[in-house]
Interface confidence: medium
C-alpha cells in the first residue's frame, strides 16, 4: 500500500461494479482502482463487500472486516471475466439484501455504496436502478456513483444521492486512478477524536467531535451524536453545530466515576451509525477543578 491519505471510519462499504461486456478490455483498470481504494479504508471496524453485475448481480464477497477475507475477495475480483448486459439494479439489490439482513440482526451500521458503471442505462434499466438505489437509501445507505466513458451524468445523479455524489471519469478507464483521492475524501466519514475525552462525573458538558465528512449527510438536520454507555444503553443527542470536520454536541450527564461512553455518529436520524474507537470517560472532579 502506498501510504497517503486514509480513512479511519467504521462503516459498511459496498463496491457495486459493472462487469458487463463493454468493460471486457478494461477490467484490470477497474480491479486496480478498487484494490487501491480498498486499502485506504483502514479501520478495524470497517466492513467491505464486493458485488458485481452484468445480466445478474452477484455478491463476490459478503460483508467482512477480516483483512484476509478481503485479500481473498480482491483475488476473486481480479479473476472476474466481464460479459452480459448492464443490470445495475441487480447490484443494488444484492447490497440492499445485505444491509437489510444486517439491520435485522441488530447491526445498525452505516452503509456507503460506491457503484461504478461505464454506460448509459436504457429506459427500464435506469428506472430499475434508480428504484433499487432508493431502496438502499431507505435502508440508510449513502450512494456514490463513478461513471466512466459513455455514462449519462444526469442518470447517475439520480441513482446517487445527488450530483455531488457522482464522480465523472471522462478520460477513460486509465483515469480511474486520478479520482481515488477525491472519492476517499468524499466517501469517508470518520470520527478521530473527542474533546474533552475525560469529563467530570455528574456534570453537563459539550463535546467537540473531531473527524471528517459530517456534512456528507443528505440532510445535516438528521446528524446525531450517539453515546453508547458502558456497552449497554445508547443516548442520542442532536448536535449544536455540524461542520465537515467537527460536531459540537451536548454530552450526556454520566453520574458515576469510571463510566465509559463510546462515540458514534448517525447521518440519518439514528437509522444507522458510524462507529469509532473514541471513548469518553468520567473522572472525579473536586469543587475547585
Amino acid at each position: 500500500e502506498d501510504g497517503g491519505p486514509a480513512c479511519y471510519g467504521g462503516f459498511d462499504l459496498y463496491f457495486i461494479l459493472d462487469k458487463s461486456g463493454s468493460v471486457l478490455h478494461h477490467w484490470n483498470e477497474i480491479y486496480y482502482f478498487v484494490e487501491q481504494l480498498a486499502h485506504k479504508f483502514i479501520s478495524p471496524q470497517l466492513r467491505m463487500s464486493f458485488i458485481v453485475f452484468s445480466t445478474r448481480g452477484t455478491t463476490l464477497m459478503k460483508l467482512t472486516e477480516d483483512r484476509e477475507q478481503i485479500r481473498q475477495g480482491l483475488e476473486e475480483l481480479q479473476k472476474v471475466l466481464p460479459g452480459g448486459d448492464t443490470y445495475m439494479h441487480e447490484g443494488f439489490e444484492r447490497a440492499s439484501e445485505q444491509i437489510y439482513y444486517e439491520n435485522r440482526q441488530g447491526y445498525r451500521t452505516a452503509s456507503v455504496i460506491i457503484a461504478l458503471t461505464d454506460g448509459e442505462l436504457h429506459e427500464d434499466l435506469f428506472f430499475y436502478s434508480e428504484r433499487e438505489a432508493n431502496r438502499s437509501r431507505d435502508l440508510g445507505a449513502i450512494v456514490y456513483c463513478v461513471g466512466v466513458k459513455d455514462f449519462n451524468e444526469t442518470q447517475l445523479a439520480r441513482i446517487a444521492d445527488s450530483k455531488d455524489h457522482v464522480f465523472p471519469v471522462n478520460d477513460g478507464f486509465q483515469a480511474l486512478q486520478g479520482i481515488i483521492h477525491s472519492i476517499l475524501k468524499k466517501s469517508c466519514i470518520e470520527i478521530l477524536a473527542a474533546e474533552p475525552s475525560t469529563i467530570c462525573a455528574g456534570e453537563s458538558f459539550q463535546v467537540v467531535v473531531r473527524g471528517n465528512g459530517f456534512r456528507h449527510a443528505r440532510n445535516v438536520d438528521r446528524v446525531l451524536c450517539s453515546f453508547k454507555i458502558n456497552d449497554s444503553v445508547t443516548l442520542n443527542e442532536k448536535p449544536f453545530s455540524v461542520e465537515d470536520t467537527y460536531l459540537l454536541c451536548p454530552a450526556p450527564i454520566l453520574k458515576e466515576v469510571g463510566m465509559k461512553a463510546a462515540l458514534q455518529v448517525s447521518m440519518n436520524d439514528g437509522l444507522s451509525f458510524i462507529s469509532s474507537s473514541v471513548i469518553i470517560t468520567t473522572t472525579h472532579c473536586s469543587d475547585g477543578s
Epitope: 439482513y101 437509501r137 431507505d138
Partner: antibody, heavy 118, light 107 residues
C-alpha cells in the same frame, strides 16, 4: 391504535384509471412503509408496491409502469393510481403498513372492492 | 421472483386437534417468512413474523418454524375461531410474494 381506511370508487371502466386513497390515523406516514396489496376473487394476495417514509416508491415489476403511488403528508394519506385497467384488475384492494427494517404487514385496512366493468 | 407454494390447499381438522401447514419457497429466504390468517370478508391478520417470532395478542397455540426454503405453521389445538385461510409471505426479496393459501376447515 393505528388504523388504515381505503376509499375510492367501487366501479371503474376498462382502460380508465383506478384511484384509491388510504387515510392513516395513529401513525405518521413520514415513518415506516405504506403498501398496497390486492386480492382478485379466488386468488392469492398480490403485493403492489409501497411508498416509504422518505417518499421513495417501490412497485411490483408485474404492474410495470401502470402503477403510481403518491402521498400527502399534510393529510397523512397515501394513494394508488393504476392506469389502463382491465377486468383482471377486479379485486379487493388493501392498504397496509410495514415497519422500517421489517417486511411483515402488521396493520391492514379493511379493504375496498373495485370492479372493472363497462 | 420468489414463488411461494403452500400445502395442502385444504386441511380438514376437528376442533381440539393439531393442524400443520406447510410453505415452501422457490429459493433460500433465510427466516424472512411471515404467516397471516384471513377470514371471509376480512383483511389478513399477521400471526407469526420471521418464521417463528410470535406477535403480542396472538394466542400461544400458533407457532412457526423453519428456515431457508421449508416452513411450517402449527396450530396446537384448533379452536372454532381458527377455521380460516392461512397465507405465508416471502419478506426476503422484492417483489414480496404470498403463497396460494391453505384453507383450514371443520372436519
Amino acid at each position: 391504535e393505528v388504523q388504515l381506511q381505503e376509499s375510492g370508487p367501487g366501479l371503474v371502466k376498462p382502460s380508465e384509471t383506478l384511484s384509491l386513497t388510504c387515510t392513516v390515523t395513529g401513525d405518521s406516514i413520514s415513518s415506516d412503509y405504506w403498501n398496497w396489496v390486492r386480492q382478485a376473487p379466488g386468488q392469492r394476495l398480490e403485493w403492489m408496491g409501497y411508498i416509504s417514509y422518505s417518499g421513495n416508491t417501490y412497485t411490483n415489476p408485474s404492474l410495470k409502469s401502470r402503477i403510481t403511488i403518491n402521498r400527502d403528508t399534510s393529510k397523512n394519506q397515501f394513494s394508488l393510481q393504476l392506469n389502463s385497467v382491465t377486468p383482471e384488475d377486479t379485486a379487493v384492494y388493501y392498504c397496509a403498513r410495514y415497519k422500517t427494517i421489517d417486511s411483515s404487514f402488521d396493520v391492514w385496512g379493511q379493504g375496498t372492492t373495485v370492479t372493472v366493468s363497462s | 421472483e420468489i414463488v411461494m407454494t403452500q400445502s395442502p390447499a385444504t386441511l380438514s381438522v376437528s376442533p381440539g386437534e393439531r393442524a400443520t401447514l406447510s410453505c415452501r419457497a422457490s429459493q433460500n429466504i433465510r427466516d424472512f417468512l411471515h404467516w397471516y390468517q384471513q377470514k371471509p370478508g376480512q383483511a389478513p391478520r399477521l400471526l407469526i413474523y420471521y418464521a417463528s417470532q410470535s406477535i403480542s395478542g396472538i394466542p400461544a397455540r400458533f407457532s412457526g418454524s423453519g428456515s431457508g426454503t421449508d416452513f411450517t405453521l402449527t396450530i396446537s389445538s384448533l379452536e372454532p375461531e381458527d377455521f380460516a385461510v392461512y397465507y405465508c409471505q416471502n419478506g426476503h426479496s422484492f417483489p414480496y410474494t404470498f403463497g396460494g393459501g391453505t384453507k383450514v376447515e371443520i372436519k
